[in-house]
């Protein structure tokens, strides 16, 4: 039975040209995390594999940095980066847990972080 929960940074906003940290945290399970995927609906951004380390998609290599931890740092943000991001935790023996973050990249300097929330 899957008992874990994913906590994410939730709905977040950031300024164009700035950077943002996408962060998820898996709790309430003793399952072993074997891999974490960072994805958009149509493409993979990065993978952190327990044995192989980090892989950043070539499309994002210039402006995505691994970490902190299992998170992902997006740099040189553009308005085209607005949208949903998914953290997919591959675990053993539980299976797959997924968290969702919505990022809004703003033209203005008014960019505030949203509240944290949980996805069971």
């Amino acid at each position: 039975m899957m008992t874990g929960t994913i906590e994410t940074t939730g709905n977040i906003s950031a300024e164009k040209g700035g950077s943002i940290i996408l962060q998820c945290h898996l709790s309430s399970t003793t399952a072993q995390v074997t891999q974490v995927n960072w994805e958009q609906q149509d493409q993979l951004l990065a993978i952190c594999n327990a044995d192989l380390g980090w892989h950043i998609s070539p499309s994002f290599k210039d402006r995505v940095a691994p970490g902190p931890g299992l998170g992902l740092t997006l740099q040189s943000l553009t308005v085209n980066d607005t949208g949903e991001y998914f953290c997919i935790y591959h675990t053993y023996p539980d299976g797959t847990y997924t968290g969702r973050i919505f990022l809004e990249v703003l033209e203005s300097s008014v960019a505030e972080h949203g509240a944290r929330f949980q996805i069971p």
Partner: antibody
Framework: QVQLQESGPGLVKPSQTLSLTCTVS?????????WNWIRQPPGKGLEWMGY???????KYNPSLKSRVTISRDTSKNQFSLKLSSVTAADTAVYYC???????????WGQGTLVTVSS | DIQMTQSPSSLSASVGDRVTITCKAS??????VAWYQQKPGKAPKLLIY???NRNTGVPSRFSGSGSGTDFTFTISSLQPEDFATYYC?????????FGQGTRLEIK
């Protein structure tokens, strides 16, 4: 438990538009995930055609982009495929499938054969 | 597009045999490969995702491995119900693409 069921004409004439519908039961297509069409010509491999996401965003295979349209009817919990200017090469079993957040497909319909012939 | 090349295209084996199918991607996809089983007249069934993760309910005799461009799918001890066609798929980026399939037949 989510189930997907394709429906539509089994025979389409060349140069016409192929239209198929996928009816989803056990899950609302506006709640989450991306809802895909994948086809398989007889005796051949699988080709991803495109998706419509729960929010209504679409993405298409560039090899078909000028001919394919995926839309949805949220009131009926259905999504649809239209493929224009069909030829015999479009004869295939057409599957609808639900994608996980990563690009893999855990849930499929049973498929429907569409033959393009005059 | 990322091309996925499977080998062999067909394979004859007996119940109890260990069977291995390989898939080669045209570019580095790290661990972003899935494997499906398809029986005649049926839809594909997801067995493995992200190179080595078994889908829910898939027997442990099915396994996957590999990273980068070279991937392997193994059935450790063939059962009668395993005779089918198997496909690899890259889950790295759109358009998602599949291998041409490996038909597994009874020897």
């Amino acid at each position: 438990q989510v189930q997907l069921q394709e429906s539509g004409p089994g025979l389409v004439k060349p140069s016409q538009t192929l239209s198929l519908t996928c009816t989803v039961s056990g899950y609302s297509i506006t709640d989450d995930y991306a809802w895909n069409w994948i086809r398989q010509p007889p005796g051949k491999g699988l080709e991803w055609m495109g998706y419509i996401s729960y929010s209504g965003d679409t993405k298409y295979n560039p090899s078909l982009k000028s001919r394919v349209t995926i839309s949805r009817d949220t009131s009926k919990n259905q999504f649809s495929l239209k493929l224009s200017s069909v030829t015999a090469a479009d004869t295939a079993v057409y599957y609808c499938a639900r994608k996980y957040y990563g690009g893999w497909f855990p849930v499929w319909g049973q498929g429907t054969l569409v033959t393009v012939s005059s | 597009d990322i091309q996925m090349t499977q080998s062999p295209s067909s394979l004859s084996a007996s119940v109890g045999d260990r069977v291995t199918i390989t898939c080669k991607a045209s570019q580095d996809v790290f661990t972003a490969v899935a494997w499906y089983q398809q029986k005649p007249g049926k839809a594909p069934k997801l067995l493995i995702y992200s190179a080595s993760n078994r889908n829910t309910g898939v027997p442990s005799r099915f396994s996957g491995s590999g990273s980068g461009t070279d991937f392997t799918f193994t059935i450790s001890s063939l059962q009668p119900e395993d005779f089918a066609t198997y496909y690899c798929q890259q889950q790295y980026s759109t358009p998602w693409t599949f291998g041409q399939g490996t038909r597994l037949e009874i020897k």
